[in-house]
């Protein structure tokens, strides 16, 4: 969470941004809020990126002004006019690229004053893992798969019964490059599992942490998975 104050004469407005992460190939959001102003035609929103000449996006006088937009963002950005009314200047970024990572500035001017705040935008790939019982293996084993990760994550297994146990000796993890040659498929197999136990497969890089849980009993298999972005405001 970053709060910036702008000073314009005696007037300043608070602008707040949240560090966020973008998933390569998907749409992302760079979050920015400001003090709403009733005089709507005076609201100017500018998004800038460190090291890039030109603007990422500009919204003024009630509409987008893309005359100074840098070509790398052409056709990929949008702010939402109805949200501007309530002080939300967040930027939608379509088809997130690895090169979109960096420091962005959300600059706001209203009839009350001006302000800005920076945000750090990280890009990578992250996806939810799925754990299945691997019946092909010679012994009872679990297979944890996640289709898209970047940078290469670490994978760890844990179990409810054997808390604190190190499963690296009885697991095998592989990373397979996907067709676009950036992201990778993560596959990890855990051998010698016992029934009536809950196992967790944890995949983590510097952007996200994902966990898949599986509980295997005589009568059923229960699964649960979750994904959490790291260092997000």
């Amino acid at each position: 969470l970053i709060i910036g104050f702008g000073i314009s004469g005696k007037h300043f407005i608070t602008v707040t941004t949240f560090t966020s992460a973008g998933n390569i190939g998907e749409d992302g959001t760079l979050s920015c809020t400001f003090e709403p102003d009733i005089k709507l035609n005076g609201i100017v929103i500018q998004w800038l990126k460190e090291g890039i000449k030109g603007l990422v996006h500009e919204f003024k006088e009630g509409k987008d002004d893309l005359s100074q937009q840098h070509e790398m963002f052409r056709g990929r950005t949008a702010v939402f006019a109805d949200q501007v009314v309530v002080g939300n200047a967040s930027l939608r970024l379509k088809n997130v690229q690895l090169t979109d990572a960096g420091t962005y500035t959300c600059y706001i001017r209203t009839s009350k004053g001006k302000g800005n705040a920076n945000l750090e935008y990280k890009t990578g790939a992250f996806s939810m893992p799925e754990i299945n019982v691997d019946y092909n293996a010679s012994s009872e084993s679990l297979r944890c798969e996640a289709p898209r990760w970047f940078p290469q994550p670490t994978v760890a297994w844990a179990s409810q019964v054997d808390q604190g146990a190190n499963f690296s000796e009885v697991s095998n993890t592989s990373f397979e490059l996907n067709s676009e040659n950036v992201t990778m498929k993560v596959v990890s197999v855990l051998y010698n599992v016992t029934i009536n136990n809950t196992y967790s497969c944890m995949i983590e890089n510097d952007i996200a942490k994902a966990t898949g849980d599986i509980k295997v009993t005589d009568s059923e298999v229960k699964r649960r998975s979750q994904l959490q972005l790291l260092n997000s405001g």
């Epitope: 009733i38 509409k63 109805d82």
Partner: antibody, heavy 116, light 107 residues
């Protein structure tokens, strides 16, 4: 001095529609949103929807979606709110106001009575 | 939608006394909150926006405070013309929503 002037009282039959107007002075239409807020007898305030001429967008409260239409005529600086399929519960004073996000100038209100 | 609640429903105060009105939001609205005063037969009048900024022409005896989910409107010394109904309104998210109101009457 900003002025928001609304049309006169209306009596309508259930099932019919009502269209009320609101004329705003000054730069209201080029700079601000126009919202409609209603107040049933003895009740509180209820935001119905609004139009932002400069943004070219309208936004309606879910409760009125499909029944309410708000339009603005920039040339005459007049906003209109039409409410269809009227029922007795729609009997209220309908206010036109300048804003959102908040409302700094209000019209005098129009009493719309829905009765058979 | 964000639900606004106000307390008390009625506040009985003597002229010259201090009145404290509360408003609560069902989720955080930051400082995106306004207060209005309404007298019988009249349109509402904007008192406060941004949780604490007085609107043009509003006397200094009216003050607003709070952020997030808890807000307060304080009238430091009630004048006869202050007896009215007071509404809070959030503008953090569409749809804009009002509280049910607090009626301030003469004790």
């Amino acid at each position: 001095q900003v002025q928001v002037v609304q049309s006169g009282a209306e009596v309508k039959k259930p099932g019919s529609s009502v269209k009320v107007s609101c004329k705003a002075s000054g730069d209201t239409f080029s700079n601000y949103a126009i919202s409609w807020v209603r107040q049933a007898p003895g009740q509180g305030l209820e935001w119905m929807g609004g139009i932002i001429p400069i943004f070219g967008i309208t936004n309606y409260a879910q409760k009125f979606q499909g029944r309410v239409t708000i339009i603005a005529d920039k040339s005459t600086r007049t906003a209109y709110m039409e409410l269809s399929s009227l029922r007795s519960e729609d009997t209220a004073v309908y206010y036109c106001s300048r804003g959102g996000p908040y409302f700094d100038y209000w019209g005098q209100g129009i009493l719309v009575t829905v009765s058979s | 939608e964000i639900v606004m609640t106000q307390s008390p429903a009625t506040l009985s105060v003597s002229p010259g006394e201090r009145a404290t009105l509360s408003c609560r939001a069902s989720q955080s609205v930051s400082s995106n909150l306004a207060w209005y005063q309404q007298k019988p037969g009249q349109a509402p009048r904007l008192l406060i926006y941004g949780a604490s900024t007085r609107a043009t022409g509003i006397p200094a005896r009216f003050s607003g405070s709070g952020s997030g989910t808890e807000f307060t409107l304080t009238i430091s010394s009630l004048q006869s013309e202050d007896f009215a109904v007071y509404y809070c309104q959030q503008y953090k998210k569409w749809p804009f929503t009002f509280g049910p109101g607090t009626k301030v009457d003469i004790k």
